[in-house]
């Protein structure tokens, strides 16, 4: 049997023996186009590529629609995998997402969405969610129907506000919404009323800002 | 179309109670703090009072704490206000508003109902 | 309570010539997050307020933008870039940075 030799996610990746946490390079669906990921191998039986990750403020994610786009920051640490390499991905499949949060006084809760995929650029990598489960809070603190993703330079939000501006990062802001995992990092006893943080409301309330975030994805049928 | 819709002004006694209601619609009013506004005749705005999205958290400014009293209903997206003991002082146009920025995020008052003039007069 | 105090109070403007309105706190209005909770908000003759600017500095969508807000701390401004007759009404000054909210006694703006 021939070894692959390109993976399109960290599932396919793991499936081929390669079961360590780490940086790998993965393949653009229908593409050669590659883009370096962090793969989970640990969590809830590995295989989880991770496209989000905050855990020290050490980069900026206020960041334009472009840098969203293509992602930004390091593997390794604080990063924004990329919106169209996400997009393109669960286009194809069905992958169920799980996030993870960490807040300031050592307790852990997450969220997992039974399905999840972003629209295309066209329709602004618009996110769709179904089936919560989860610590993280019994509603999602993602708004449903999903919404638009929103940077700075970019307003696709449904408030007369510009959310992305005033609430800092690119998400999938509605008016503005109840969660913010892009929003401004705040450490330690810092991290309280500050509407502009790291949110998510279901679990912490509006003006709690979390340690850290980690969001990751896996084919549903891992 | 975000709408505040407002009614239960009009003229009472000093002493008596009045209950003004507000009926919002274009919205998901279970997500938006609210609150009441006044503007005695020819004078300025004053904030009257707040109440959070799920009602969990009330605040009174000192000159109506003890006699006005808000709520809300999601189910029937509306907001309330129920005046007690009025006052001449109390004669005033009232506005419902709403935050600018849901799940009480108090940025200013995004939108205004059409304002009730509440008349107390003996 | 904190205290807003507006000038002018009446503003009598040529359209098209510029206008300027002050907002002065008695305390400053920098929140810990960065930003100050001040907006500005104009009421037109017979009108319920309707927002301007948010935040010190944001304009809400659908006001023009001739109108813009800055300042800081105690100090803050509004500006009209070029008055025109719409823009008459009184505009009010409100901050939310420390409970209760409060506003200023407005500023009249009338065309000569």
């Known amino acids: 049997k021939e070894e692959q030799t390109t993976f399109r996610d960290c599932a396919e990746i793991f499936k081929s023996g390669l079961t360590t946490s780490g940086i790998y390079t993965l393949t653009f669906p229908n593409s050669t186009e590659e883009i370096k990921a962090y793969c989970d191998m640990d969590v809830g039986g590995g295989g989880w590529t991770v496209i989000q990750h905050r855990e020290d403020g050490s980069v900026d994610f206020q960041r334009t629609w472009k840098e969203y786009k293509e992602g930004f920051g390091s593997p390794l640490g604080e990063y924004w995998l990329g919106n169209e390499f996400v997009s393109q991905l669960t286009g194809q499949h069905r992958y169920v997402l799980k996030i993870q949060l960490k807040d300031w006084e050592g307790n852990e809760a997450h969220s997992l969405y039974d399905h999840f995929y972003l629209a295309g650029e066209e329709s602004n990598y618009r996110i769709h969610l179904t089936g919560l489960t989860g610590t993280a809070g019994k509603i999602s603190s993602i708004s449903q129907p999903g919404s638009d993703f929103s940077t700075k330079d970019s307003d696709n939000d449904k408030c007369i506000c510009k959310c992305s501006q005033m609430l800092s990062g690119g998400w999938w802001f509605d008016a503005c919404g109840p969660s913010n995992l892009n929003g401004q990092y705040y450490p330690q006893k810092q991290n309280t009323n500050k509407f502009n943080g790291i949110k998510w409301y279901y679990w912490k309330g509006s003006g709690y800002s979390l340690k850290a975030t980690t969001m990751m994805i896996r084919p549903a049928d891992f | 179309e975000v709408q505040l819709v407002q009614s239960g002004g009009g003229v009472v006694q000093p002493g008596r109670s009045l209950r003004l209601s507000c009926a919002a619609s274009g919205f998901t009013f279970s997500s938006y703090g609210m609150h009441w506004v006044r503007q005695a005749p020819g004078k300025g705005l004053e904030w009257v009072s707040y109440i959070s999205s799920s009602g969990s958290t009330i605040y009174y400014a000192d000159s109506v704490k003890g006699r006005f009293t808000i709520s809300r209903d999601n189910a029937k997206n509306s907001l309330y206000l129920q005046m007690n003991s009025l006052r001449a002082e109390d004669t005033a146009v009232y506005y419902c508003?709403?935050?600018?920025?849901?799940?009480?995020?108090?940025?200013?008052?995004?939108?205004w109902g059409q304002g009730t003039l509440v008349t107390v007069s003996s | 309570d904190i205290v807003m105090t507006q000038s002018p109070l009446s503003l009598p403007v040529t359209p098209g010539e510029p206008a300027s309105i002050s907002c002065r706190s008695s305390q400053s209005l920098l929140h810990s997050n960065g930003y100050n909770y001040l907006d500005w908000y104009l009421q037109k003759p017979g009108q319920s307020p309707q927002l301007l600017i948010y935040?010190?500095?944001n304009r809400a969508s659908g006001v023009p933008d001739r109108f813009s807000g800055s300042g800081s701390g105690t100090d803050f401004t509004l500006k009209i870039s070029r008055v025109e007759a719409e823009d008459v009404g009184v505009y009010y000054c409100m901050q939310g940075t420390h409970w209760p909210p409060t506003f200023g006694q407005g500023t009249k703006l009338e065309i000569k």
């Open positions: 935040l010190g500095s």
């Open positions: 508003a709403r935050d600018l920025l849901d799940y009480d995020i108090l940025t200013g008052y995004g939108y």
